[in-house]
């Protein structure tokens, strides 16, 4: 009994058969998040959990200085979750007195990073304006989409403010992708 | 025509070729939940339509008593949306006249439960804070993430409060995992 | 060594081994969208790219007029967010005097046409009540789930109100669905 | 070496307004959230307020919200505590200290404290 | 708001006791929670963040344990520096609260 024999008609023989068990596949876990140098105009990335309780790399999918890599090409389902949690931001009709302390918003980059590339690719953005009214506020963002990607490039997290990020649950924060 | 013959070279020969038709999944619906007994700190499991409608589980991925029930050890990915609905909650200054409408957060955990082990797990969060200004609310929480999960091993969704998830329709709030 | 030899007991024969990278796929995103004729009670549908930037099609999976087709049986994830944006949403005491710039709510519906079938089946949505204090709101909605699609399906994305869409960016909204 | 300095303590009557200062000096002080920290005479501590490293996000205690209020100068290694419409129960050594990335987290370096007295 | 409960509220200890303060939370805090020492006109000190992290710099019969709600910080062995009032906070959520206090005094 051969691969093709039930192969639909229209499948390419040029197409490789792979055993799903060895595609590359990460699930990273959010840790408390170290000083990092803020540029004007630029989202700091998030540094992850790669091996402990949720977090694992598998098959070549490696984890290292805040990035994902590629280790082969092909179409990547690719998913992260951040929580935001902060005080007090006034936003309403005393909003125009300027108070520095207001977040005008909450946003994730989910951002690829080809080497051959001068200028990183955003796959994914989340972006939310928060007006709290309330003295204690958190409510996460959610992504997720297929990608093409290439052997080698990067992936990274990015947000807008990492001092706003609830590292307090492995469940709460986290960045995966998987080969399809 | 032989299966090995154009795998790449990193595929390993112990990797089980499979036909991806054949493997578990299931897309679980909402229903009206009925009341339930829980206890302090403990949120509620929600239960679902497995057959009806949009629903449906396949390949051993078996539904009983709100927990999807894994039938074969590997990558999953599981999801799950749940939308709430509820009443003014006002919830500035005025909050600590401690109205009894008005919850401080929703949250959406989904959980596995492996029998030899005796806490659950919680394996994705989704959580946010509820200050409303208007008469009626309603929003959706959204979680999506992959994890290793054993056979055996049993997924549910819980709520911080049962009475205010939307069971009116069947696209609003669902519950799915499948085998990768 | 031949596909079968090392498959799982439970694995049947019948189930074609099918290669990967020959799956209908697709990452669909947004465009400014054009003024469209839209019925009393039914929401909009929003069109897309296909083809430029992030955005693809492969495999059969093809876009066409606002669809995308599904070119073979089977089940598909299928996912998007649309990111929402808009001025002022006054909605507390002074609610009742009818601002028209106040939409009560955002939704996304992912929707199947199916062509023997005389009703569209309402496959997700995602829908959010719309109560900002602040001048201007932003913020998306995420979908995804797992669905048995037949030959000549077709997928759409209907929103509430076409003209609150984010189409500024290809990473803010975006519609797609692969073969599982 | 980290350390943190308040000044503008005193003896201040009720209704009256205080501001308290804290210099920071010994590590990057734009890179950390901030706090103040109060001990009453005899009893526990109890946090007063926090502020982000960008004064992004802000909190108080509810014992001092609406009369208290928080800031900083990132170009001054300074912290600031704006403290109107006092009471007797302000009465307290009030602590500066230094927390970590996320304003919710715990202190890991404190000033000696300056001493606020509201007596009529 | 978490409330914290410290216990007890005085010990009294000789030098080489093992001493043991418990912590509990109103509702789960995970390991989200630190050690302070103050001694008599000084600023408190760090000795353990998340329930059981031994701060740089702090000896090392100072330890912590617990997560949840019932936690502990043990001195395996008092010494004459230990006798001071210790301090346990939350920082799970806002607003960041502290427990009453255990003085440590010489028996």
């Known amino acids: 009994l051969k691969g093709q024999e039930f192969a639909p008609s229209h499948q390419q023989v040029y197409a490789p058969l792979r055993a799903d068990g060895d595609k590359p596949r990460a699930h990273l876990t959010v840790v408390r998040q170290t000083p990092t140098q803020h540029f004007k105009n630029q989202f700091p990335a998030l540094h992850w959990e790669h091996e402990l309780g949720l977090a694992f790399t598998k098959n070549r999918m490696n984890y290292t200085n805040k990035f994902l890599l590629i280790p082969e090409s092909g179409d990547y389902f690719i998913y992260s979750q951040v929580t935001f949690r902060g005080m007090t931001s006034e936003c309403s009709e005393i909003r125009q007195a300027g108070r520095p302390n207001k977040p005008d918003s909450i946003t994730v980059v989910i951002t690829k990073v080809t080497d051959s590339y001068p200028e990183p690719t955003q796959l994914l953005m989340g972006t939310k304006s928060v007006c709290e009214v309330g003295s204690n506020w958190f409510q996460p963002i959610y992504l997720g989409a297929m990608f093409s990607l290439q052997e080698g490039d990067k992936l990274m997290v990015n947000v807008s403010d990492i001092s706003l990020v609830d590292y307090t649950k492995e469940d709460k924060t986290f960045f995966g992708a998987f080969l399809l | 025509l032989k299966g090995q013959e154009f795998a790449p070279s990193h595929q390993q020969v112990y990797a089980p070729l499979r036909a991806d038709g054949d493997k578990p999944r299931a897309h679980l619906t909402v229903v009206r939940q009925t009341p339930t007994q829980h206890f302090k700190n403990q949120f509620p499991a929600l239960h679902w339509e497995h057959e009806l409608g949009l629903a449906f589980t396949k390949n051993r991925m078996n539904y009983t008593n709100k927990f999807l029930l894994i039938p074969e050890s590997g990558d999953y990915f599981i999801y799950s949306q749940v939308t709430f609905r509820g009443m003014t909650s006002e919830c500035s200054e005025i909050r600590q006249a401690g109205r009894p409408n008005k919850p401080d957060s929703i949250t959406v955990v989904i959980t596995k439960v492996t029998d030899s082990y005796p806490e659950p797990t919680q394996l994705l969060m989704g959580t946010k804070s509820v200050c409303e200004v208007g008469s009626n609310w309603f929003q959706p929480i959204y979680l999506g993430a992959m994890f290793s999960l054993q056979e055996g091993d049993k997924l549910m969704v819980n709520v911080s409060d049962i009475s205010l998830v939307d069971y009116t329709k069947e696209d609003k709030t669902f519950f799915g995992a499948f085998l990768l | 060594l031949k596909g079968q030899e090392f498959a799982p007991s439970h694995q049947q024969v019948y189930a074609p081994l099918r290669a990967d990278g020959d799956k209908p796929r697709a990452h669909l995103t947004v465009v400014r969208q054009t003024p469209t004729q839209h019925f009393k009670n039914q929401f909009p549908a929003l069109h897309w790219e296909h083809e430029l930037g992030l955005a693809f099609t492969k495999n059969r999976m093809n876009y066409t007029n606002k669809f995308l087709l599904i070119p073979e049986s089977g089940d598909y994830f299928i996912y998007s967010q649309v990111t929402f944006r808009g001025m002022t949403s006054e909605c507390s005491e002074i609610r009742q005097a009818g601002r028209p710039n106040k939409p009560d709510s955002i939704t996304v519906v992912i929707t199947k046409v199916t062509d023997s079938y005389p009703e569209p089946t309402q496959l997700l949505m995602g829908t959010k009540s719309v109560c900002e204090v602040g001048s201007n709101w932003f913020q998306p909605i995420y979908l995804g789930a797992m669905f048995s699609l037949q030959e000549g399906d077709k997928l759409m994305v209907n929103v509430s109100d076409i003209s609150l869409v984010d189409y500024t960016k290809e990473d803010k909204t975006f519609f797609g669905a692969f073969l599982l | 070496e980290v350390q943190l300095v308040e000044s503008g303590g005193g003896l201040v009557q009720p209704g009256r307004s205080l501001r308290l200062s804290c210099a920071a000096s010994?590590?990057?002080?734009?890179?950390?959230?901030m706090h103040w920290v109060r001990q009453a005479p005899g009893k526990g501590l109890e946090w007063v307020s926090g502020i982000s490293w960008n004064s992004g996000s802000i909190g108080y205690a509810d014992s001092v919200k609406g009369r208290f209020t928080i800031s900083r100068d990132n170009a001054k290694n300074s912290l600031y505590l704006q403290m109107n419409s006092l009471r007797a129960e302000d009465t307290a050594v009030y602590y500066c200290a230094k927390g970590q990335v996320a304003p919710l987290d715990h202190f890991d370096y404190w000033g000696q404290g300056t001493l606020v007295t509201v007596s009529s | 708001d978490i409330q914290m409960t410290q216990s007890p509220s005085t010990l009294s200890a000789s030098v080489g006791d093992r001493v043991t303060i418990t912590c509990r939370a109103s509702?789960?805090?995970?390991?989200?929670l630190a050690w302070y020492q103050q001694k008599p006109g000084k600023a408190p000190k760090l000795l353990i963040y998340?329930?059981?992290s031994l701060e740089s710099g702090v000896p090392s019969r100072f330890s912590g344990s617990g997560s949840g709600t019932e936690f502990t910080l043990t001195i395996s062995s008092l010494q004459p520096d230990d006798f001071a009032t210790y301090y346990c906070e939350q920082y799970n959520s806002y607003p960041l609260t502290f427990g009453g206090g255990t003085k440590v005094e010489i028996k």
């Open positions: 509702q789960s805090i995970s390991s989200w």
């Open positions: 998340d329930a059981s």
């Open positions: 010994g590590f990057t002080f734009d890179d950390y959230a």
